[in-house]
Amino acid sequence: QTSVSPSKVILPRGGSVLVTCSTSCDQPKLLGIETPLPKKELLLPGNNRKVYELSNVQEDSQPMCYSNCPDGQSTAKTFLTVYWTPERVELAPLPSWQPVGKNLTLRCQVEGGAPRANLTVVLLRGEKELKREPAVGEPAEVTTTVLVRRDHHGANFSCRTELDLRPQGLELFENTSAPYQLQTFVLPATPPQLVSPRVLEVDTQGTVVCSLDGLFPVSEAQVHLALGDQRLNPTVTYGNDSFSAKASVSVTAEDEGTQRLTCAVILGNQSQETLQTVTIYSFPAPNVILTKPEVSEGTEVTVKCEAHPRAKVTLNGVPAQPLGPRAQLLLKATPEDNGRSFSCSATLEVAGQLIHKNQTRELRVLYGPRLDERDCPGNWTWPENSQQTPMCQAWGNPLPELKCLKDGTFPLPIGESVTVTRDLEGTYLCRARSTQGEVTRKVTVNVLSPRYE
């Protein structure tokens, strides 16, 4: 009778085991072991027992002890069970960002591991078990579906294998995959709201505001604002689930024309974009051209108003005929025209919006000098010893210098309060002089003596 010890062994892959083959007869003709494994016999005294070291056990094996005794041949098998933890425990790769409400399939793949009867695959969210299944197939695959929720944001998903050899007197061997950290997000289907000027003048600044509500997590949202090829640098303000991005935009003559203003919001692996057109325009103030800004009375003056070629102008409130960017008027300069304003108003339609600009010029008319009865009376009669103020106003542009002299030497104190004396009586020659020439006027002062009764 042949016997083997131990009859059952569980050992780690690549490990070694000592197997003893024994026989019941004292003088066996043969005693040995049959195995494909590398073996080494350990020398022992006696003929009815042999010990073998079996090494590099890579897989389950059933070495067989045999003996040939006088009463016949017999065999005995030992059962070697190899255990090893899986070589690969992996979650199938997934985008880290997942939209809330999406069904997310987690797939765990397990390569190797034995004995499979003792190997279990567990899918976890944090420490919470989502699914537990025995490892079947090579590679073994376990899947589960998770409905992505907002509160899953930042959760770690992993896959764990459990090789439970505690019934065999060993321990529980665990292998865990690299975690998959889920980033959940909500990007609403509505595009961002973009508020900006429809039109913008060159060499000016405008403000652009892009906003969106209903985002999660709002702090992770990326906002890209651009006008044509010009990236804008917004200041972003966050609310609970909203943001508002405000940027200043400066435009130059090179930007003139229709430009695309874009606001793109990127969250997770999705984006929403709003496009708007902004028309950049150049509109210098209209020009008011006077043939000469300063003319003499009686001179013909042409006043021209010129604006942007697409503008419509009015000159002193009168529309150009025909309607367009130029208007003009002709006038013969009179003293009344001195200081007269000529106002050119221009309206430019840019993308349907009306832009208004204005320029005003003043005409200076040189005239005079003038001395007339109304402003410089030719005759004064005043009572002696009364207080009087001689008035004589000379008109002209430039304002004339005025002198009133009696006998070429005695001045009449124009505009000053004087006590009337006999000396004041007489005829004065008032002379008004300016660069435009001179005029004279005779002024007579009569002094009335008081009558004594």
């Epitope: 419509k312 102008v313 009015t314 409130g317 009168v318 309206t347 993308a351 919006q353 208004h356």
Partner: antibody, heavy 122, light 110 residues
Framework: QSVEESGGRLVTPGTPLTLTCTAS????????MSWVRQAPGKGLEWIGI?????TTYYASWAKGRFTISKTSTTVDLKITSPTTEDTATYFC???????????????????WGPGTLVTVSA | GYDMTQTPASVEVAVGGTVTIKCQAS??????LVWFQHKPGQPPKRLIY???TLASGVSSRFKGSGSGTHFTLTISGVESADAATYYC????????????FGGGTEVVVK
């Protein structure tokens, strides 16, 4: 000075229809002209405008549904593919004025036609 | 754009009374505002232009005021003939996608 619309009639959905606005006593080369409509029980709705030079602008809801064009004396409004929602009275209005105190031009519907009725029905 | 918000949508007033209609622009339109009166079967009638200037042939019972974004039309000594829908209209822009008219105010005279 006057404007008058014509061309309004009963049409079946999808049949293009062109309305014409005829200007008298002023030159279209000096004015912007707008089309406005009023559907039964609704308010006034601006459809679009054509400038003195022929540039057009449209309300957002009207883009692609209407086309405005002009000749020297008329302004046309084409309803490209009418639907029952386009049943309305259509008005043409001169939409350009200037303010003599500032000298600026502005949009002002100062002259209106009597309107023309368009009925879209199957 | 220049959204025009008109309030109230409807108002009832007794003959001889006063009615006030407000119009608010979403952005400043300076004084470029026009008020219209519209009766069924007729073209709209221009009452006020440049926010406060009375159109020729319009009764002085109609008064317009305001500038920038807030405007008011006041009808005093209301007559039965004033029963109509009143609209404000901005004269600043006719851009693509623009809002030109307010929503209208129906005035019912008792």
């Amino acid at each position: 000075q006057s404007v008058e619309e014509s061309g309004g009639r009963l049409v079946t959905p999808g049949t293009p229809l062109t309305l014409t606005c005829t200007a008298s006593g002023f030159s279209l080369s000096n004015y912007y002209m707008s089309w406005v409509r009023q559907a039964p029980g609704k308010g006034l709705e601006w459809i679009g405008i054509i400038s003195d030079s022929g540039t057009t602008y449209y309300a957002s809801w009207a883009k692609g549904r209407f086309t405005i064009s002009k000749t020297s004396t008329t302004v046309d409004l084409k309803i490209t593919s009418p639907t029952t929602e386009d049943t309305a009275t259509y008005f043409c209005a001169r939409d350009w004025s200037y303010d003599s105190s500032s000298g600026y031009y502005y949009y002002d519907m100062d002259l209106w036609g009597p309107g023309t009725l368009v009925t879209v029905s199957a | 754009g220049y959204d025009m918000t008109q309030t109230p949508a409807s108002v009832e007033v007794a003959v001889g009374g006063t009615v006030t209609i407000k119009c608010q622009a979403s952005q400043s339109i300076n004084s470029w505002l026009v008020w219209f009166q519209h009766k069924p079967g007729q073209p709209p009638k221009r009452l006020i232009y440049k926010a406060s200037t009375l159109a020729s042939g319009v009764s002085s019972r109609f008064k317009g005021s305001g500038s920038g974004t807030h405007f008011t039309l006041t009808i005093s000594g209301v007559e039965s003939a004033d029963a109509a829908t009143y609209y404000c209209q901005q004269g600043y822009s006719r851009s693509d996608g623009e809002h030109v008219f307010g929503g209208g105010t129906e005035v019912v005279v008792k």
